[in-house]
């Protein structure tokens, strides 16, 4: 599932390159392992912002698929309460390219621990 999430992220990156979206997104670029679920939640919430701002059907479908995949992969620990983690709004705002790169890094963290 996580491998499919990465391919969806690459697809979103390709789709966005053909558009002009200037959004800045809350991005966790240095995820601590004990906060990875919280960070994933922030990434997914911000991904929905991309979908809404793009107004593009392919991006919308890919984001929805990515959320479904991530949800199922995290169904066992998605409700784990992590303490001492940053709120999404406390994270640094970065452009879409940097956001997607950081997103791939966190997904790789999940792949390495699964």
């Amino acid at each position: 599932n996580w491998v499919n999430v990465i391919s969806d992220l690459k697809k979103i990156e390709d789709l966005i390159q053909s558009m002009h979206i200037d959004a800045t997104l809350y991005t966790e670029s240095d995820v601590h392992p004990s906060c990875k679920v919280t960070a994933m939640k922030c990434f997914l919430l911000e991904l929905q912002v991309i979908s809404l701002e793009s107004g593009d059907a392919s991006i919308h479908d890919t984001v929805e698929n990515l959320i479904i995949l991530a949800n199922n992969s995290l169904s066992s620990n998605g409700n784990v309460t992590e303490s001492g983690c940053k709120e999404c709004e406390e994270l640094e705002e970065k452009n879409i390219k940097e956001f997607l790169q950081s997103f791939v890094h966190i997904v790789q963290m999940f792949i390495n621990t699964s």
């Epitope: 997914l44 979908s51 392919s58």
Partner: antibody, heavy 122, light 112 residues
Framework: EVRLMESGGGLVKPGGSLKLSCAAS????????MSWVRQTPEKRLEWVAT????????YYPDSVKGRFTISRDNAKNTLYLQMSSLRSEDTALYYC???????????????WGQGTSVTVSS | DVLMTQTPLSLPVSLGDQASISCRSS???????????LEWYLQKPGQSPKLLIY???NRFSGVPDRFSGSGSGTDFTLKISRVEAEDLGLYYC?????????FGGGTKLEIK
């Protein structure tokens, strides 16, 4: 008023195939994900398949995965369910339903058709 | 898979009474983004199911305010404050937080 009209049901032998259709009207079909849901003779409901707005992504429960294929033709405003290797437990009334977007709405099935009956028996 | 357990199986009521239907999931159905995709559907005799409530407590357009949904995590409830004749039928809860999406077994609301 949103309209969904299923067709293609009938009597089929175990191991056989059938293709169901769902004609959509009175809404922009390509703006919505769609699902198939079936109701057994005992009145239990079972989710069968979901397809994304553009048709690139499909989802199934294990009970039908590899046997059923959901697809859509946005130009014809039509949803399909290709069923193969049919079993007696696939006997049910099959409904198509429109899905509200997870991102902009509640991810619910807000409108359903009247259903088409499938009987698998020798 | 998430198992959805509905109780009671049958609920005999008098018109004007309050009715309450319970739905319990085998695991939390709060998704990673914090949403709980729990719906309630009503199937009247001879009709297809109709959406009543989505995301636990949101009433679908045209649904009377005597219907209300509540709950969180694994425990959910549908309440009908004053049952009317048109409310009779089969009620189903449904989770679409996690694939495979699953329905409860149904509750038949009938006249006592």
């Amino acid at each position: 008023e949103v309209r969904l009209m299923e067709s293609g049901g009938g009597l089929v032998k175990p191991g056989g195939s059938l293709k169901l259709s769902c004609a959509a009207s009175e809404f922009t079909f390509s703006n919505y994900a769609m699902s198939w849901v079936r109701q057994t003779p005992e009145k239990r409901l079972e989710w069968v398949a979901t397809i994304s707005r553009g048709g690139d992504y499909t989802y199934y429960p294990d009970s039908v995965k590899g046997r059923f294929t959901i697809s859509r033709d946005n130009a014809k405003n039509t949803l399909y369910l290709q069923m193969s290797s049919l079993r007696s437990e696939d006997t049910a009334l099959y409904y198509c339903a429109r899905r509200v977007s997870m991102i902009t709405g509640g991810w619910a099935m807000d409108y359903w058709g009247q259903g088409t009956s499938v009987t698998v028996s020798s | 898979d998430v198992l959805m357990t509905q109780t009671p199986l049958s609920l005999p009521v008098s018109l004007g009474d309050q009715a309450s239907i319970s739905c319990r999931s085998s695991q939390s159905i709060v998704d990673i983004t914090g949403n709980t995709y729990l719906e309630w559907y009503l199937q009247k005799p001879g009709q297809s199911p109709k959406l009543l409530i989505y995301k636990v407590f949101n009433r679908f357009s045209g649904v009377p305010d005597r219907f209300s949904g509540s709950g969180s995590g694994t425990d959910f409830t549908l309440k009908i404050s004053r049952v009317e004749a048109e409310d009779l039928g089969l009620y189903y809860c449904f989770q679409d937080s996690f694939v495979p999406y699953t329905f409860g077994g149904g509750t038949k609301l009938e006249i006592k």
